[in-house]
């Protein structure tokens, strides 16, 4: 069944994507694109990393985790209804046809009108510590820990299961990882 990630208009949305570098600082290029992953490359690129740094990003799209440790999860700032749709995380693993690609479906809901502040129950609110610092250098926020190594199908599935705040709260101190190399 299709998995959805949800956020409300005006909030930040979070789309998880992780890998484990083969060695510290031995990074793999990653691109994020709007729209389903094409078979080659990324289309409609909103953010791209190379072997060392974030080398391209567009307004409102950024990485808040420590991408040098393989947390390449995408944050979209101050979302609108137009941000709904499929996003592609492509991990460009070196070698012939080794790329791993994941489609993540983002659904933006109209903002709730509530008379008094209540605890938010959407996906983004489950990750407040990951949404507090903007920057493209080493993340100033605490990074996710690691679960035991799992295969790429499992990471996609596990990442998909982070879609509601209950699961997100349960898993907020863990993270699915892909080990490269």
């Amino acid at each position: 069944s299709e998995v959805e990630y949800r956020a409300e208009v005006g909030q930040n949305a979070y789309l998880p994507c992780f890998y484990t570098p083969a060695a510290p600082g031995n990074l793999v290029p990653v691109c994020w694109g709007k729209g389903a992953c094409p078979v080659f490359e990324c289309g409609n690129v909103v953010l791209r990393t190379d072997e060392r740094d974030v080398n391209y990003w567009t307004s409102r799209y950024w990485l808040n985790g420590d991408f040098r440790k393989g947390d390449v999860s995408l944050t979209i700032e101050n979302v609108t209804l137009a941000d709904s749709g499929i996003y592609c995380c492509r991990i460009q693993i070196p070698g012939i046809m080794n790329d791993e690609k994941f489609n993540l479906k983002l659904v933006i809901k109209p903002a709730k009108v509530t008379p008094a502040p209540t605890r938010q129950r959407d996906f983004t609110a489950a990750f407040p510590r990951m949404l507090t610092t903007r920057g493209h250098g080493p993340a100033e926020t605490q990074t996710l820990g690691s679960l035991p190594d799992i295969n790429l199908t499992q990471i996609s599935t596990l990442a998909n299961e982070l879609r509601d705040s209950r699961l997100a709260n349960d898993l907020r101190d863990s993270g699915a990882t892909i080990r490269i190399g």
């Epitope: 998995v3 389903a36 992953c37 094409p38 078979v39 994941f102 489609n103």
Partner: antibody, heavy 119, light 112 residues
């Protein structure tokens, strides 16, 4: 407008190397990928290789050992070499554009070039 | 490699008739987000192929809406609702999720 055109020899001897050129206009090779697909007479299509917009290369594993693809972005040309030719390599060779989105995969094609490999 | 099996290999239709072509894959062409990487191309006689349908059910640019695609997983169908004379040619399905990309053997549509 977008155009792709294949050029190269129409007849090649077996065991020789086939060198094909795809010259494109109406778009930049740094924004779009260009792939090669062939069609033996009366048969179906077979994907050969692609040079992506970012310069990455992907090959059909069944042909990989005999293939080389590269490009000259300044001349808007993509080149395909097929070596150690067999008569089964006789086909119409198409170059085609990959727009790097799912809705533009092979959205424009060249007219095709018929290549005969003789023994 | 992914094997795509197209049926029938040849199809005869009269103008205005509705026809369907089947494409079956040896592996699933859908991912966990429900995206299905199946494409349909039409190759008219003596011409290059042209994109008809992408992602199983989306109409390519400038393609008449008498063409429609459906299916997910491993079973797919292309339907032409009311065949026109310009529809004759060979229809190819292609999968775009696994490298190498592979095509079906083609279905030739003839006009009676």
């Amino acid at each position: 407008q977008v155009q792709l055109k294949e050029s190269g020899p129409g007849l090649v001897q077996s065991s020789q190397t086939l060198s094909l050129t795809c010259t494109v206009s109406g778009f930049s090779l740094t924004n779009y990928g260009v792939g090669w697909i062939r069609q033996p007479p009366g048969k179906g299509l077979e994907w050969i290789a692609i040079m992506t917009s970012g310069g990455s290369t992907y090959y059909n594993s069944a042909l990989r050992a005999r293939l080389n693809i590269n490009r000259d972005t300044s001349k808007s040309q993509v080149f395909l070499e097929v070596n150690s030719l067999h008569t089964e390599d006789t086909a119409t060779y198409f170059c085609t554009r990959d727009g790097t989105t799912v809705e533009t995969l092979f959205d424009y094609w060249g007219q095709g070039l018929m290549v005969t490999v003789s023994s | 490699d992914v094997v795509l099996t197209q049926t029938p290999s040849t199809l005869s239709a009269i103008i205005g008739q509705s026809v369907s072509i089947s494409c079956r894959s040896s592996q699933s062409l859908s991912d966990s987000a429900g995206i299905t990487y199946l494409y349909w191309y039409l190759q008219r006689p003596g011409q290059s192929p042209q994109l008809l349908i992408y992602l199983a059910s989306n109409l390519g640019s400038g393609v008449p809406n008498r063409f429609s695609g459906s299916g997910s997983g491993t079973d797919f169908t292309l339907k032409i609702s009311g065949v026109e004379p310009e529809d004759l040619g060979v229809y190819h399905c292609m999968q775009g999720i696994h490298v190498p990309l592979t095509f079906g053997s083609g279905t030739k549509l003839e006009i009676k």
